[in-house]
Amino acid sequence: PEPPTACREKQYLINSQCCSLCQPGQKLVSDCTEFTETECLPCGESEFLDTWNRETHCHQHKYCDPNLGLRVQQKGTSETDTICTCEEGWHCTSEACESCVLHRSCSPGFGVKQIATGVSDTICEPCPVGFFSNVSSAFEKCHPWTSCETKDLVVQQAGTNKTDVVCGPQDRLRA
């Protein structure tokens, strides 16, 4: 029979014959021959291969370096890489999460629109009229100004985006 020029899925062409690829979690040791199938071997501890392959070496699992603020989110297997995330209060600097930075705090006059996660930074928004934030925080939203009216008080000092209103007693009517 004519030697093949193309092979089926999960096969590769070598020496004019189609050999089976190694399954995820295994590496290639020896190509198939006329008499035997492809020889594959499981990846070692702390190694992985995540596709059908003909790799002769497995990849090393990612190391989540605590010195860079990283910790293991999901332990790697022979078929998957380790997934790193950042310690509490920190987030990844990239999609690959190779290092971490401290979550940004929202300055006075700004509130937290979205709290940071292990992979995304804090999103701040300016406090609109009627709201304020007087602290630098990675968690605090803009707070509404105090409603003096509901307390039977009057505004003595107008609020800003950084300060609350100051309420005071109503002026007594003279007799």
Partner: antibody, heavy 112, light 112 residues
Framework: EVQLVESGGGLVKPGGSLRLSCAAS????????MSWVRQAPGKGLEWVSE????????YYPDTVTGRFTISRDNAKNSLYLQMNSLRAEDTAVYYC?????WGQGTLVTVSS | DIVMTQTPLSLPVTPGEPASISCRSS???????????FEWYLQKPGQSPQLLIY???NRFSGVPDRFSGSGSGTDFTLKISRVEAEDVGVYYC?????????FGGGTKVEIK
């Protein structure tokens, strides 16, 4: 030219041990699974063991499992068969084979 | 274990005439990956076995085209289109798909 040369055969008492060797040349030894096949006097062929090209996997029939161990040294282009607890019924010519090519065989005689 | 049954046991042949040997396996010898590791070997008098056919129907290099193999599943055939005097010897079928690998009992081909 492909060559497979066996050595190590001889006369051994029942219960004894013997180590066969096979020196290979003329082909990419590490690419091929290698086997030992035996032939008792006046009888047919019997497969005894196989080892994969990289040496990761070994296979045996029940008749020799636990007594025989196949191994290889790809750096030396050599195949081995360690035979322990030998029995009279292990008497045979032992061939080293890559399936495509066979050695000339070495005679193992187990007798008291 | 897979039993390989060859017929006939003995085959007297006339040079120039065709000859056919049958081999039947006790179960399918298709490997899990889809290949059928079935081979035919010839052992000429006083010599080591030599490969004739691999994977059912592929002639090994240097094997004359008068030899052909066919079959599938459990039934396999070796045909010699025109027997020559040098073809005498014992023919063995072999399955290398499932451990333990097994040989047929052999068919002795001799000139009438």
């Amino acid at each position: 030219e492909v060559q497979l040369v066996e050595s190590g055969g001889g006369l051994v008492k029942p219960g004894g041990s013997l180590r066969l060797s096979c020196a290979a040349s003329g082909f990419t030894f590490s690419s091929y699974a290698m086997s030992w096949v035996r032939q008792a006097p006046g009888k047919g062929l019997e497969w005894v063991s196989e080892i994969s090209g990289g040496g990761s996997y070994t296979y045996y029939p029940d008749t020799v499992t636990g007594r025989f161990t196949i191994s290889r040294d790809n750096a030396k282009n050599s195949l081995y068969l360690q035979m322990n607890s030998l029995r009279a019924e292990d008497t045979a010519v032992y061939y080293c084979a890559s399936r495509a090519y066979w050695g000339q065989g070495t005679l193992v005689t187990v007798s008291s | 274990d897979i039993v390989m049954t060859q017929t006939p046991l003995s085959l007297p042949v006339t040079p120039g005439e065709p000859a056919s040997i049958s081999c039947r396996s006790s179960q399918s010898i298709v490997h899990s990956q889809g290949n059928t590791y079935f081979e035919w070997y010839l052992q000429k008098p006083g010599q080591s076995p030599q490969l004739l056919i691999y994977k059912v129907s592929n002639r090994f290099s240097g094997v004359p085209d008068r030899f052909s193999g066919s079959g599938s599943g459990t039934d396999f055939t070796l045909k010699i289109s025109r027997v020559e005097a040098e073809d005498v010897g014992v023919y063995y079928c072999f399955q290398g798909s499932h451990v333990p690998y097994t040989f047929g009992g052999g068919t002795k081909v001799e000139i009438k």
